[in-house]
């Protein structure tokens, strides 16, 4: 399984490694794993049209910025085929090091 | 079959401005970023630029002003101005790799001569 | 600006034995790090990308490692067709890049 290693509070990118054929196009949510289940991660649609131009690679990461101990775990993206039936999915580790004992919470935000 | 290849290297004096081309098969231009690298005899791989699916362009900052990437739906163009000797090179076309697993995507042509001598 | 810094420049290896490259970023890339081989007369093959993806048809001595700012090529059981140039590469960003490749290093098979 992939890993990103990050300092806390820096910014972390973390690739979608679903299978995904970059002549299509696909809609992407981002969820992180958690023992208890699944716990959506907030990926506001204002960012789909970001002028921020990412290499066509980046393509539906997700960017955590000011990442503390409480943003490590497993992260799941989802790809659904715009106007077609296959849905993708990948999954990445994030572990942050370094980071004081009070956590405070992350922000998030994606490319595309 | 997926392919690139680059040409319209040659022999150049000092000043001459010189277009190389490269040209894709089997994939769409749409949907991938192309670079094109040199590489002067005995040295290493040198970013020139990129472009992306969408057009956007991006340079190396020695590169700015001097160089230009376009497409067209088939070729990717390198438009140089004012050749130097210090542009001799192996000039390489490649596709980037697109993102996703189980096929990587990178595609590099064989690389196109161009020497400038006076 | 994103700077790729690889070490070392030049590294001589028996056969059988093992070789590790380092490549270190000036800035986080996260995973977005390939490596290539290049021999003379030829244009650069992927060996491994997403900074630990084999790619395919490359043999398993090949591993990579790493992410953020630091990456690793380790070569085992080296061979003497492995004797070439490798560099590493930054896909991460193209924005206030000078080069978004490493310098190269050179392995000598003894």
């Known amino acids: 399984m992939r890993e990103v290693t990050v300092a806390c509070s820096e910014t972390a990118d973390l690739p979608c490694t679903a299978p995904w054929d970059p002549q299509l196009s696909y809609a992407v949510s981002w969820a992180k794993v958690s023992e208890s289940g699944t716990e959506s991660v907030e990926l506001p649609e204002s960012k789909q049209n970001s002028s921020f131009e990412a290499p066509r690679r980046r393509a539906y990461s997700l960017t955590i910025q000011n990442t503390t101990i409480c943003s490590s775990g497993t992260y799941r993206c989802a790809l659904q085929e715009l106007g077609g039936q296959r849905n993708l999915s990948g999954t990445v580790v994030l572990k942050v090091t370094g980071c004081p004992k009070e956590a405070t919470e992350s922000t998030f935000r994606k490319y595309r | 079959c997926q392919s690139v290849e680059e040409s319209g290297g040659r022999l150049v004096t000092p000043g001459t401005p010189l277009t190389l081309t490269c040209t894709v098969s089997?994939?769409?231009?749409?949907?991938?970023?192309m670079t094109w690298v040199r590489q002067a005899p005995g040295k290493g791989l040198e970013w020139i630029g990129i472009?992306?699916?969408?057009?956007s362009t991006y340079y190396a900052s020695w590169a700015k002003g001097r160089f230009t990437i376009s497409k067209t739906s088939t070729t990717v163009d390198l438009e140089v101005t004012s050749l130097t000797t210090e542009d001799t090179a192996t000039y390489f076309c490649?596709?980037?790799?697109?993102?996703?697993?189980?096929?990587?995507?990178?595609?590099w042509g064989p690389g196109t001569l161009v020497t400038v001598s006076s | 600006a994103y700077d790729m810094t690889q070490t070392p420049a030049s590294v001589e290896v028996a056969v059988g034995g093992t070789v590790t490259i380092k490549c270190q970023a000036s800035q986080s890339i996260s995973t977005y790090l390939d490596w290539y081989q290049q021999k003379p007369g030829q244009p650069p093959k992927l060996l491994i990308y997403d900074a630990s993806d084999l790619a395919s048809g490359v043999p398993s001595r090949f591993k990579g490692s790493g992410s953020g700012t630091q990456f690793t090529l380790t070569i085992s059981d080296l061979e003497c067709a492995d004797a070439a140039t490798y560099y590493c590469q930054q896909g991460y960003t193209h924005s206030n890049v000078d080069n978004v490749f490493g310098g190269g290093t050179e392995v000598v098979v003894k």
């Open positions: 490649s596709r980037e790799h697109a993102g996703y697993s189980g096929d990587t995507g990178h595609l």
């Open positions: 089997g994939f769409s231009l749409s949907s991938y970023d």
């Open positions: 472009i992306y699916a969408s057009g």
